[in-house]
Interface confidence: medium
């Protein structure tokens, strides 16, 4: 005969774990249902009744299957120098990133506290290291034989064109001028642009849980020795630490 399917809540066999999308409730000592993303546990299970889930309130979310007593608060509204690249919904947090041409000058775990415009390299200087979401552009003087005639946060130093006959020699901020009508170049003409940094998620990451047999003690849920964590069975919990400079 096929094994009977157990319905939550049920007592697990000794040494076994609860199934996917279930968690072990220490108080009831039963395997109980988790709540789906966008919901939270309104009433915890007992020996005779399963978890009662409820939708997250406005400006709160849960991203994973969970048994948290309250949903997580979405991060602060984005500041004027940021763009909201992901809206706050019942299932996901708001994500703010610095607007194009800017980078994060000061950040904490909560996200970017202050955006700053990317440095522009003036004529005679080119981009040595492009800006990223969290670091500024690094400029360098154009080496002999190269130039940049722009003020830009993306242009690198380009080689002077090679003339048959030079009318005006090039310098760090100006290309060579040829008298010949057919100059040659060691690389294609036109400004060379470095790609703009690609924004990555910078705000409020959720902790991932321990296996359901050992509920985590996430800092998000300061409520006793074994509070519930979000996520599915078998994930590992990432503790967030603030790194001192």
């Amino acid at each position: 005969l096929p094994a009977q399917v157990a319905f939550t809540p049920y007592a697990p066999e000794p040494g076994s774990t609860c199934r996917l999308r279930e968690y072990y409730d220490q108080t009831a000592q039963m395997c109980c249902s988790k709540c789906s993303p966008g919901q939270h546990a309104k009433v915890f299970c007992t020996k005779t009744s399963d978890t009662v889930c409820d939708s997250c309130e406005d400006s709160t979310y849960t991203q994973l299957w969970n048994w948290v007593p309250e949903c997580l608060s979405c991060g602060s509204r984005c500041s004027s120098d940021q763009v909201e690249t992901q809206a706050c919904t019942r299932e996901q947090n708001r994500i703010c990133t610095c607007r194009p041409g800017w980078y994060c000058a000061l950040s904490k775990q909560e996200g970017c506290r202050l955006c700053a415009p990317l440095r522009k390299c003036r004529p005679g200087f080119g981009v040595a290291r492009p800006g990223t979401e969290t670091s500024d552009v690094v400029c360098k003087p154009c080496a002999p034989g190269t130039f940049s005639n722009t003020t830009s946060s993306t242009d690198i130093c380009r080689p002077h064109q090679i003339c048959n006959v030079v009318a005006i020699p090039g310098n760090a901020s100006m290309d060579a001028v040829c008298t010949s009508t057919s100059p040659t170049r060691s690389m294609a003409p036109g400004a060379v642009h470095l790609p703009q940094p690609v924004s990555t998620r910078s705000q409020h990451t959720q902790p991932t849980p321990e296996p359901s047999t050992a509920p985590s003690t996430s800092f998000l849920l300061p409520m006793g020795p074994s509070p519930p964590a979000e996520g599915s069975t078998g994930d590992h919990h990432h503790h967030h630490h603030h790194h001192h400079h």
Partner: antibody, heavy 120, light 111 residues
Framework: QVQLQQSGAELARPGTSVKLSCKAS????????IDWVKQRTGQGLEWIGE????????YYNEKFKGKATLTADKSSSTAYMQLSSLTSEDSAVYFC?????????????WGQGTSVTVSS | DIVLTQSPASLAVSLGQRATISCRAS??????????MHWYQQIPGQPPKLLIY???NLESGIPARFSGSGARTDFTLTIDPVGAVDVATYYC?????????FGGGTKLEIE
């Protein structure tokens, strides 16, 4: 307008604990940090740490780790600081202050302070 | 930790004159063109009050006689002209990195 209302003065015995509160109003409590600052009589200001109530994340001055524990209750918009294993060195006025996540990066609104006296 | 050294420790200025308070950091508090240095006023028996944020920005509601300047490691708070209501202790504070630190304070008196 932004207001931070702190709990009343505390008189405590050495070795015991006290829990100070700071009730915020006039802004979205979960959007900004609450900082705690210590000031001994006639002395300067010392940063203890801060909490981001939206997530419960805390940042401590190493000097106060193990001494101060910061928590926040979103439902009542109240931040708490528990001081444990009190000694005479903990006798001071403790201020809570708001620090916006964005912009100023400074403590722009302060509570009135809570005086803690540790005496046997 | 970033150490902030204020000078002078106390200062006596005549009404209507200029008061200048200095704050020196043990390392730069600048990042990307921003100086994470702030100035507070504390009147006895009251909590500190933010005057200047990020080196030179005047906090809302603070009189224009208060101004801040400086960059990297050297910062100045100027009160010009000094009024009787300005008798207080003034603190600088950095928020570039944890732990945030304060200067030792400068006590301003009227002579």
């Amino acid at each position: 307008q932004v207001q931070l209302q702190q709990s009343g003065a505390e008189l405590a015995r050495p070795g015991t604990s006290v829990k100070l509160s700071c009730k915020a109003s006039g802004y979205t409590f979960t959007d900004d940090y609450i900082d705690w600052v210590k000031q001994r009589t006639g002395q300067g200001l010392e940063w203890i740490g801060e909490i981001y109530p939206g997530s419960g994340n805390t940042y401590y001055n190493e000097k106060f780790k193990g001494k101060a524990t910061l928590t926040a209750d979103k439902s009542s918009s109240t931040a708490y600081m528990q001081l444990s294993s009190l000694t005479s060195e903990d006798s001071a006025v403790y201020f809570c202050a708001r620090s916006q996540v964005y912009g100023k990066i400074a403590m722009d609104h302060w509570g009135q302070g809570t005086s803690v006296t540790v005496s046997s | 930790d970033i150490v902030l050294t204020q000078s002078p420790a106390s200062l006596a200025v005549s009404l209507g004159q200029r008061a200048t308070i200095s704050c020196r950091a043990s390392e730069s508090v600048d990042n990307s063109g921003n100086s994470f240095m702030h100035w507070y006023q504390q009147i006895p028996g009251q909590p500190p009050k933010l005057l200047i944020y990020r080196a030179s920005n005047l906090e809302s509601g603070i009189p224009a006689r208060f101004s801040g300047s400086g960059a990297r490691t050297d910062f100045t708070l100027t009160i010009d002209p000094v009024g009787a209501v300005d008798v207080a202790t003034y603190y600088c504070q950095q928020s570039k990195e944890d732990p945030y630190t304060f200067g030792g304070g400068t006590k301003l008196e009227i002579e």
